[in-house]
């Protein structure tokens, strides 16, 4: 004869567990069904009534079959530096994450507690490694040949124009000026300039570069103090 | 937390070499620049170069090009200045600060080495 | 080089006090303008560093603000822990600090 499918609630036999979506009552010292997502024990069942579940309130939420007297409260809303990517439901929590420009510095299980600015590389630094979710931007020094003259999360250091004949020769946060109407070529396309090993050495005197962007020998002028960067912006 | 520890006060005779340290801890080293700056008895601070761990790339002020050379060892978390051809007047207290490339500049700082140079 | 002329590079003042220190820069330094207390042996301390950005746990009454090439710090009323001497420090282009204003009580 085939088993008999026991309902709710009943006794286990000896050694055995409850099914699946099912718990042991210790008091009743019977399986009893748990109630779903969205819903909590409103009543807990005894020897002859099973669980009986009630909706979960407003701001509040189960997300597995459960047995709990009580719904979770949902997170707090999201702060001015987060958003919500999860809404609040009967079933879910909420789920807030950084908003575009922030990385999180403090995660929670699900979400971020801590939200932080990307860092910013100022003039005469570009991003090394760009932020993720979960990490921040680090900014490393242009290499000799390169520059940035922008505060930003996002900007790499980018390489001196070339000229026919330097005007003013590039620093690492100002690009060379030309005294001919324009350059004669600048990267070669496709080339990423991120900060990257040089010799050590001050960064005031500006290396013969490699051959593949050899400029005329006027551009190798030892680099003296030169005004800002016109273009550069504050924070 | 942010620590920099740097090495113990030393005196020198003129014409010698000194070499700080500065060790490093409670963040990723190789993310920030290491500086160095000095300050003579009650006078002000001056800038004397920086040094990024990660590459070894460095800028030095003017002044110090010729004698100063700017180290890092990543294995141990630690920058180094060597200042050579002492003289009596770079008699001074020797810092060292991070610097995250931001415009937050110089957020932590060693405790000072004192550099005493004297016939 | 950019050079940072800071005055006065002495104040006497009372507890309570409003207290100004300025910075002239030679050049345009933007907004990269840093300020810097340091107290007798102990090693400097950022207070304010892109002209108007109050680092973490540095008290309200410590304020930055500018005016073309000439920067201020403010302390809006001086307490007795705020005696001592004040740097700023330009790097915007290559670093440079100003002399110094050193604070006493009155």
């Known amino acids: 004869l085939p088993a008999q499918v026991a309902f709710t609630p009943y006794a286990p036999e000896p050694g055995s567990t409850c099914r699946l979506r099912e718990y042991y009552d210790q008091t009743a010292q019977m399986c009893c069904s748990k109630c779903s997502p969205g819903q909590h024990a409103k009543v807990f069942c005894t020897k002859t009534s099973d669980t009986v579940c009630d909706s979960c309130e407003d701001s509040t939420y189960t997300q597995l079959w459960n047995w709990v007297p009580e719904c979770l409260s949902c997170g707090s809303r999201c702060s001015s530096d987060q958003v919500e990517t999860q809404a609040c439901t009967r079933e879910q929590n909420r789920i807030c994450t950084c908003r575009p420009g922030w990385y999180c510095a403090l995660s929670k299980q699900e979400g971020c507690r801590l939200c932080a600015p990307l860092r910013k590389c100022r003039p005469g630094f570009g991003v090394a490694r760009p932020g993720t979710e979960t990490s921040d931007v680090v900014c490393k020094p242009c290499a000799p040949g390169t520059f940035s003259n922008t505060t930003s999360s996002t900007d790499i250091c980018r390489p001196h124009q070339i000229c026919n004949v330097v005007a003013i020769p590039g620093n690492a946060s100002m690009d060379a000026v030309c005294t001919s109407t324009s350059p004669t070529r600048s990267m070669a396309p496709g080339a990423v300039h991120l900060p990257q090993p040089v010799s050590t050495r001050s960064q005031h005197t500006q290396p013969t570069p490699e051959p593949s962007t050899a400029p005329s020998t006027s551009f190798l002028l030892p680099m003296g103090p030169s005004p800002p960067a016109e273009g550069s912006t504050g924070d | 937390q942010v620590q920099l520890v740097q090495s113990g006060a030393e005196v020198k005779k003129p014409g010698a070499s000194v070499k700080v340290s500065c060790k490093a801890s409670g963040y990723t080293f190789t993310d920030y620049i290491i500086h160095w700056v000095r300050q003579a008895p009650g006078q002000g601070l001056e800038w004397m170069g920086w040094i990024d761990p990660d590459y070894g790339n460095t800028d030095y002020a003017d002044k110090f090009k010729k004698r100063v050379t700017m180290t890092a060892d990543t294995s141990i978390s630690t920058a180094f200045m060597e200042l050579s051809r002492l003289r009596s007047d770079d008699t001074a207290v020797y810092y060292c600060?991070?610097?995250?490339?931001?415009?937050?500049?110089?957020?932590?700082w060693g405790q000072g080495t004192l550099v005493t140079v004297s016939s | 080089d950019i050079q940072m002329t800071q005055s006065p590079s002495s104040l006497s003042a009372s507890v309570g006090d409003r207290v100004t220190i300025t910075c002239q820069g030679s050049?345009?330094?933007?907004?990269?303008l840093a300020w810097f207390q340091q107290k007798p042996g102990k090693a400097p301390k950022l207070l304010i560093y892109?002209?108007?950005s109050l680092q973490t746990g540095v008290p309200s009454r410590f304020s930055g603000s500018r005016s073309g090439t000439d920067f201020t710090l403010t302390i809006s009323s001086l307490q007795p822990e705020d005696f001592a001497t004040y740097f700023c420090?330009?790097?915007?282009?290559?670093?440079?600090f100003g002399g110094g204003t050193k604070l006493e009580l009155k």
């Open positions: 050049q345009n330094i933007d907004n990269y």
């Open positions: 892109s002209t108007y």
């Open positions: 420090f330009q790097y915007n282009n290559g670093y440079m």
């Open positions: 600060a991070r610097d995250d490339a931001s415009p937050l500049v110089m957020d932590a």
